[in-house]
């Protein structure tokens, strides 16, 4: 800031320092600094320093403060959705038998039509309409990797419910990968959670779009509410505008 | 606000409305409202309305905006830590054999000494020092429920690493439960993630405090770095102060 | 929290979220947004007194820090805390578009 | 983002995070906080121009909304965006205490 602003800057600094004095005392609920009359001489005990250091250290898996949104997130995102490939498609044939899993495949050409470039994607959600559920169920979501290998993505504990409910899984990273790769069909697997010592691995939850024996209108409604990817992305023309204005202010 | 302030309020409203005009156009990267000359007559297509409604609905599992911190979170939190009960304690005897899990038990009297009331606890983290790891490992954390039943809490994908690293799991809810109950010893289990179709369930990761055959100083250092609960809580005397000043401003 | 539950039902003179419904047609003269017809934008208004100086080290003032200047700013300001997005439907040529606009609805305010 | 990486290395005149190290002993005259000896508190400073009126509907101004008034406030204000906590060690009587103070360190600012 210019030199003429130095006095203002110093004044603001002084007011900020003054305010911090009040802030710290206030946060500690102290009317004035605590008496130091009982403090023993010498350094802090080792255990106290260890505790202080534990508190100070950011560690793996600890939720830090949320990151401020990047500049691109200020701009509007176009919303599209891509429905799951219908279950009578041949891709499902080799996966039909399982009692612990259901499979959801998506046509990547449809995804590319909605989002031409991976970098444009700002959020992708897998949405599933969960029908009523009698017992609590712990489910896991996997991404199809190579031929028959699956990569764990996330999990959810589903509470019993008498009414249908939409579930949402954040799959932004996965869809961004799919848009970068050449594959035609990509997919997810929803499985019962299996612990190492428990062998009860039946998927109890009923997801709309997988139940059989429906006819006519009901099947159509059912099909419309089948799993889908909700995509939020920067439109291509807006993105080009963004790239050209990368300079600061 | 008092009637004398009405004019100010109206002015602010007008400026806010004006600003929103610019904000919406800016977010859409439009210099002016779009031409409506090509818009077909009639209502919006069903599919578009469905998509609009999908976007508008908050659904289970979708990350909403972060909640603003409650008043109590403004105030300082006292930090304490409770080390895991050492592994030579008899409580571990019945759990020693497993290849897919390690067990961590805590003395609830120590927890209660640190946090006398469950409501005072604002955060509890289980911290584990992970030693070097040769392969990627997917681990799960469970809470001891009844005699031999375990409740799933969370999971973590651990990347290979040549250096030790502290891991942190948020276990606030669990510790709050423990503080409310009468139990003397409560515990966690860290297990290899087992998918329903894979049977490779060996826990590869080496957590400090569980390896055997150490002597003297090394064992002490090792013991000090054994798993612990890092607790952040409102001190009792500050909480009473908070309750008495529940009135607004 | 200085949210809609508290602020809309009180006569709070200090920083609070204030009601403001924007009707796209009436307020902005716009007919091009097809859905929604308007939305509760709301706004933040009210003073955030600067309440600390060296001669004010007493409990009454300190207890007010939480509301008036929790961030210990040199010039605290009443600003949005919790915000929500707004989806809209409009046409580009013959094509209807659904777009999500981030941070359009003010749910609560804070002194910052 | 108007964060320490950008602001500390630029001569930005508008809203930005500014460097401020608080030494508890020198700046506050306090000897009672045993750890840390001080901390980088930082602060937000700089104008957030109000850049919209009915006669300014053109691209140049609209592109600036992002920085100057993203929240479409009637009086945009330069305030903290990302904040971090500060743990401290002090004595209560003979007993050392570790306490965590939330939102003490300003990492980035925004016009709001």
């Amino acid at each position: 800031l210019s030199t003429s602003k130095t006095i203002d800057m110093e004044l603001v600094k002084r007011k900020r320092i003054e305010a911090i004095r009040g802030q710290i005392l206030s946060k500690l609920r102290l009317a004035s600094p605590p008496s130091q009359g009982e403090v023993p001489p010498g350094p802090l005990p080792e255990a106290v320093l260890a505790l202080y250091n534990s508190t100070r250290d950011r560690v793996a898996g600890e939720s830090a403060e949320p990151e401020p949104e990047p500049e691109a997130d200020y701009y509007a995102k176009e919303v599209t959705r891509v429905l799951m490939v219908e279950t009578h498609n041949e891709i499902y044939d080799k996966f039909k038998q399982s009692t612990h899993s259901i499979y959801m495949f998506f046509n990547t050409s449809e995804l590319r039509e909605a989002v031409p470039e991976p970098v444009l994607l700002s959020r992708a959600e897998l949405r599933l309409l969960r029908l009523k559920l009698k017992v609590e169920q712990h489910v896991e979501l996997y991404q199809k990797y190579s031929n028959n290998s699956w990569r764990y993505l996330s999990n959810r504990l589903l509470a019993p419910s008498d009414s249908p409910e939409w579930l949402s899984f954040d799959v932004t990273g996965v869809v961004r990968q799919w848009l970068s790769r050449g594959g035609e069909i990509e997919g997810f697997r929803l499985s019962a959670h299996c612990s190492c010592d428990s062998r009860d691995n039946t998927l109890q939850v009923d997801i709309n779009g997988f139940t059989t024996g429906r006819r006519g209108d009901l099947a159509t409604i059912h099909g419309m509410n089948r799993p889908f990817l909700l995509l939020m992305a920067t439109p291509l023309e807006r993105a080009q505008h963004l790239q050209s204005s990368r300079h600061r202010r | 606000l008092s009637t004398s302030k009405t004019i100010d309020m109206e002015l602010v409203k007008r400026k806010r409305i004006e600003a929103i005009r610019g904000q919406i156009l800016s977010k859409l990267r439009l210099a002016s409202p779009p031409s409506q000359g090509e818009v077909p007559p009639g209502p919006l297509p069903e599919a578009v309305l469905a998509l609009y409604n999908s976007t508008r609905d908050r659904v289970a599992g979708e990350s909403a905006e972060p909640e603003p911190e409650p008043e109590a979170d403004y105030y300082a939190k006292e930090v304490t830590r409770v080390l895991m009960v050492e592994t030579h304690n008899e409580i571990y005897d019945k759990f020693k054999q497993s290849t897919h899990s390690i067990y961590m038990f805590f003395n609830t009297s120590e927890l209660r000494e640190a946090v006398p009331e469950p409501v005072l606890l604002s955060r509890a983290e289980l911290r584990l020092l992970r030693l070097k790891l040769k392969v990627e490992q997917h681990v799960e954390l469970y809470q001891k429920y009844s005699n031999n039943s375990w409740r799933y809490l969370s999971n973590r994908l651990l990347a290979p690493s040549d250096s030790p690293e502290w891991l942190s799991f948020d276990v606030t809810g669990v510790v709050r439960q423990w503080l409310s109950r009468g139990g003397e010893i409560e515990g966690f289990r860290l297990s290899a993630h087992c998918s329903c179709d894979s049977r490779d369930n060996t826990l590869q990761v080496d957590i400090n405090g569980f390896t055997t055959g150490r002597r003297g100083d090394l064992a002490t250092i090792h013991g000090m770095n054994r798993p612990f609960l890092l607790l952040m809580a409102t001190p009792l005397e500050r909480a009473q102060h908070l309750q008495s000043s529940r009135h607004r401003r | 929290a200085l949210d809609t539950n508290y602020c809309f039902s009180s006569t709070e003179k200090n920083c609070c979220v204030r009601q403001l419904y924007i009707d796209f047609r009436k307020d902005l003269g716009w007919k091009w947004i097809h859905e929604p017809k308007g939305y509760h934008a709301n706004f933040c208004l009210g003073p955030c007194p600067y309440i600390w100086s060296l001669d004010t080290q007493y409990s009454k003032v300190l207890a007010l820090y939480n509301q008036h200047n929790p961030g210990a700013s040199a010039a605290p300001c009443c600003v949005p805390q919790a915000l929500e997005p707004l989806p809209i439907v409009y046409y580009v040529g013959r094509k209807p578009k659904v777009e999500q606009l981030s941070n359009m609805i003010v749910r609560s305010c804070k002194c910052s | 983002a108007l964060d320490t990486n950008y602001c500390f290395s630029s001569t930005e005149k508008n809203c930005c995070v500014r460097q401020l190290y608080i030494d508890f002993r020198k700046d506050l005259g306090w000897k009672w906080i045993h750890e840390p000896k001080g901390y980088h508190a930082n602060f937000c400073l700089g104008p957030c121009p109000y850049i919209w009126s009915l006669d300014t509907q053109y691209s140049k101004v609209l592109a600036l909304y992002n920085q100057h008034n993203p929240g479409a406030s009637a009086a945009p204000c330069c305030v903290p965006q990302a904040l971090e906590p500060l743990p401290i060690v002090y004595y209560v009587g003979r007993k050392p205490k570790v306490e965590q103070l939330s939102n003490m360190i300003v990492r980035s600012c925004k016009c709001s």
Partner: antibody, heavy 119, light 107 residues
Framework: EVQLLESGGGLVQPGGSLRLSCAAS????????MTWVRQAPGKGLEWVSA????????YFADSVKGRFTISRDNSKNTLYLQMNSLRAEDTAVYYC????????????WGQGTLVTVSS | DIQLTQSPSSLSASVGDRVTITCRAS??????LNWYQQKPGKAPKLLIY???NLQSGVPSRFSGSGSGTDFTLTISSLQPEDFATYYC?????????FGGGTKVEIK
């Protein structure tokens, strides 16, 4: 204004006793630990004893342990040093000082009182 | 007990000179070191606390540095009123101990 005023010094025979006082003013006495430091003629400073604000904790140099006791009366804003079994090497100017903080620096000192142990 | 060794025990300097006094501890004392100034017939006066912090009211020509076992008191430009004896003191552990002192005399 912080003031510390020592009294009670004088001539005493070896083996005798003496009680030094330090009257404090200008600050909240009970909030501060207090200390005694002595200086033999022509020599350097030697720390003698200290006491916490409440009087609950006391500290002594090895050279006076078991012979000297430190105490305080917070209602009278006064610090004491009871010296028994005095020796010739205890001859010195005795200063009382205020312990400023948990770092144990002595920020205010009295003018001192002379204790002479001689037969 | 922790021993503090001051050097030099005395020095002669002129007004305007830069003067450096060192204090060495027999074991590490972190930054638990204070510096005092004493003039003949007067009580000591605190100059520097916690190795490097200037006590309120003390001229800025005085500065302290160091950590662990080696510490320094520096007077950047000696003034007439600075001719005195200077003591270091450790507060790392009881018994608290002082250095032997450094007498700064007029050359």
């Amino acid at each position: 204004e912080v003031q510390l005023l020592e009294s009670g010094g004088g001539l005493v025979q070896p083996g005798g006793s003496l009680r030094l006082s330090c009257a404090a003013s200008g600050f909240t006495f009970a909030d501060y630990a207090m200390t005694w430091v002595r200086q033999a003629p022509g020599k350097g400073l030697e720390w003698v004893s200290a006491i916490s604000g409440s009087g609950a904790a006391t500290y002594f140099a090895d050279s006076v342990k078991g012979r000297f006791t430190i105490s305080r009366d917070n209602s009278k804003n006064t610090l004491y040093l009871q010296m028994n079994s005095l020796r010739a090497e205890d001859t010195a100017v005795y200063y009382c000082a205020r312990v400023s903080s948990g770092h144990w620096d002595f920020d205010y000192w009295g003018q001192g009182t002379l204790v002479t142990v001689s037969s | 007990d922790i021993q503090l060794t001051q050097s030099p025990s005395s020095l002669s300097a002129s007004v305007g000179d830069r003067v450096t006094i060192t204090c060495r501890a027999s074991q590490s004392i972190s930054s638990y070191l204070n510096w005092y100034q004493q003039k003949p017939g007067k009580a000591p006066k605190l100059l520097i606390y916690a190795a490097s912090n200037l006590q309120s009211g003390v001229p800025s020509r005085f500065s302290g540095s160091g950590s662990g076992t080696d510490f320094t008191l520096t007077i950047s430009s000696l003034q007439p009123e600075d001719f005195a004896t200077y003591y270091c003191q450790q507060t790392y552990t009881v018994p608290l101990t002082f250095g032997g002192g450094t007498k700064v005399e007029i050359k």
